[in-house]
């Protein structure tokens, strides 16, 4: 059957350059049209670049042309995409996908390649907890939480009592903020008598820096 | 370039619903219009090309119609699997573009949200920073309002908002808003409170704290 | 997610009546409106048999089973029930309860003539 597998994305800073792959399997690779289409965090879809089958047509969003360029190998069963002088707003998951015969739309996609350009370096997050208290109770049920701050890039793993807690979690996608550093909170509620009883601690993994923080969360001494 | 308009951006319906999105090309693009679906996390899925072609292995309640610059795809009945982001495409010109999507979600009962505040802790003050935290939990429709007020002055620019995804067993959103300051600027002041708006509450709820008090 | 377990299909005479349920898990199914899908032994797709809303107000069926198939729920029990009369041999399918972005795992009917 028709294949498309992706690779080549990854971190990279503004301005520099970076190449995707489409390896492809299952067709005549020489014989089809093949495009990129990207998608920003989530936005929707945006057509990029177009190279026929035969090489003599290449065609650029207005938002990429004179920075990204199309090309592809028959020997190799591979269309690439070439991409310099990034900028942020190019961050997106990046999908190569291939038209039905001569009709241009997109019958076949590759599974996708996230690119995300950034000025920040991989920094490991801090982890502060949301305290549970009169603020944060009602009807006898209590929030309690973990903000984890300031990490790059994504993503984070959040689990509470490792794993042995479930129910009532909520962990929100990350934000990015002025700095470029990402920031989440995870949340769970709970019954408030079981505040001084139970212990709640949220696990928390940043594989890219390769930290892991578990941190109890209880409730203010005062 | 072709512009494609599509309406609505999200639609709330239930299972067994017929459902129809609709797409406008900005000119006349014939029938070169392609339709996809798209879930969380995975690649776009082609269902109808040529406007109303439905592409193999594509369910028959999937029906597109159309030409020119009007077109729509409707769901007869709405099923489990369904619950989607749609996109359309023309492809009569070079630049393939797409719509905005319409997210077809779960439509549940309101639900008015809990609402908790959370000072920041100690250990973030240390760092400099004090990040103040609104939880909405557990509400419906998405739409909330989160208005922040320090000594009751309305905040603007210093906040982030991030909503989950729609929970599969009730239905419902939770939203948390957090409200960034210098630890210098977050001292200057005393009362912090986050104000909420939403259609399941009767008036706008606000939950607040005393910085430095328990 | 929300488990569903539909329960109550069997082998039944042509003109004959049956009753299927579907049971949930959590009580959050009150929030709900909920469809019974049918899926015939040779059918390529499930087809829309009934749909209740939320709080049993709202009903709705498709133009084969109006007159002969009622739906209901108690939300009490957290269960919606199909109530199948004047079976036809045509009515013979797996049935499936939805919720949401749930289904169930099915329940066969097999109405004889």
């Known amino acids: 059957q028709v294949q498309l597998v992706q690779s080549g994305g990854g971190v990279v800073q503004p301005g520099r350059s970076l190449r995707l792959s489409c390896a492809a399997s299952g067709f005549t690779f020489s014989r089809y049209t093949i495009h990129w289409v990207r998608q920003a965090p989530g936005k929707g879809l945006e057509w990029v670049a177009v190279m026929s089958y035969n090489g003599n047509n290449k065609h650029y969003a207005d938002s990429v042309n004179g920075r990204f360029t199309i090309s592809r190998n028959d020997s190799k069963n591979t269309l690439y995409l070439n991409m310099n002088s990034l900028r942020p707003e190019d961050t997106a998951v990046y999908y190569c996908a291939r038209i039905r015969d001569t009709a241009m739309f997109f019958a076949h996609w590759g599974q996708g390649t996230l690119v995300t350009v950034s000025s920040a370096s991989t920094k490991g997050p801090s982890v502060f907890p949301l305290a549970p208290s009169s603020k944060s109770t009602s009807g006898g049920t209590a929030a309690l939480g973990c903000l984890v701050k300031d990490y790059f890039p994504e993503p984070v793993t959040v689990s509470w009592n490792s794993g042995a807690l479930t129910s009532g979690v909520h962990t929100f996608p990350a934000v990015l903020q002025s700095s470029g550093l990402y920031s989440l909170s995870s949340v769970v509620t709970v019954p408030s008598s079981s505040l001084g009883t139970q212990t709640y601690i949220c696990n928390v993994n940043h594989k890219p820096s390769n930290t892991k923080v578990d941190k109890k969360v209880e409730p203010k001494s005062c | 370039d072709i512009q494609m308009t599509q309406s609505p951006s999200t639609l709330s319906a239930s299972v067994g619903d017929r459902v129809t999105i609709t797409c406008r090309a900005s000119q006349s693009i014939n029938t070169w219009l392609a339709w996809y679906q798209q879930k969380p996390g995975k690649a776009p899925k082609l269902l109808m090309y040529k406007a109303s072609s439905l592409e193999s292995g594509v369910p028959s309640r999937f029906i597109g119609s159309g030409s020119g610059t009007e077109f729509t795809l409707t769901i007869s009945s709405l099923q489990p699997d369904d619950f989607a982001t749609y996109y359309c495409q023309q492809y009569n010109s070079d630049s393939k573009m797409f719509g905005q999507g319409t997210k077809v979600e779960v439509k549940g009962t309101v639900a008015a949200p809990s609402v908790f505040i959370f000072p920041p802790s100690d250990e973030q003050l240390k760092s400099g920073t004090a990040s103040v935290v609104c939880l909405l939990n557990n509400f419906y429709p998405r739409e909330a309002k989160v208005q922040w007020k320090v000594d009751n002055a309305l905040q603007s620019g210093n906040s982030q908002e991030s909503v989950t995804e729609q929970d599969s067993k009730d239905s419902t959103y939770s939203l948390s808003s957090t409200l960034t300051l210098s630890k210098a600027d977050y001292e200057k002041h005393k009362v912090y409170a986050c104000e909420v708006t939403h259609q399941g509450l009767s008036s706008p709820v606000t939950k607040s704290f005393n910085r430095g008090e328990c | 997610q929300v488990q569903l377990q539909d329960s109550g299909g069997g082998l039944v005479q042509a003109g004959g009546s049956l009753r299927l349920s579907c049971a949930a898990s959590?009580?959050?199914?009150?929030?709900?409106?909920v469809a019974w899908f049918r899926q015939t032994p040779g059918g390529k797709e499930r087809e829309f048999v009934a749909?209740?809303?939320?709080?049993?107000?709202?009903?709705n069926y498709a133009d084969s089973v109006k007159g002969r198939f009622t739906v209901s729920r108690d939300n009490v029990k957290n269960t919606v029930f199909l109530q199948m009369s004047t079976l036809k041999p045509e009515d013979t399918a797996v049935y499936y309860c939805?919720?949401?972005?749930?289904w169930g795992q099915g329940t066969q009917v097999t109405v004889s003539s």
């Open positions: 749909q209740i809303n939320w709080n049993g107000d709202s009903t």
């Open positions: 939805a919720a949401g972005s749930n």
């Open positions: 959590s009580r959050t199914f009150s929030v709900y409106t």
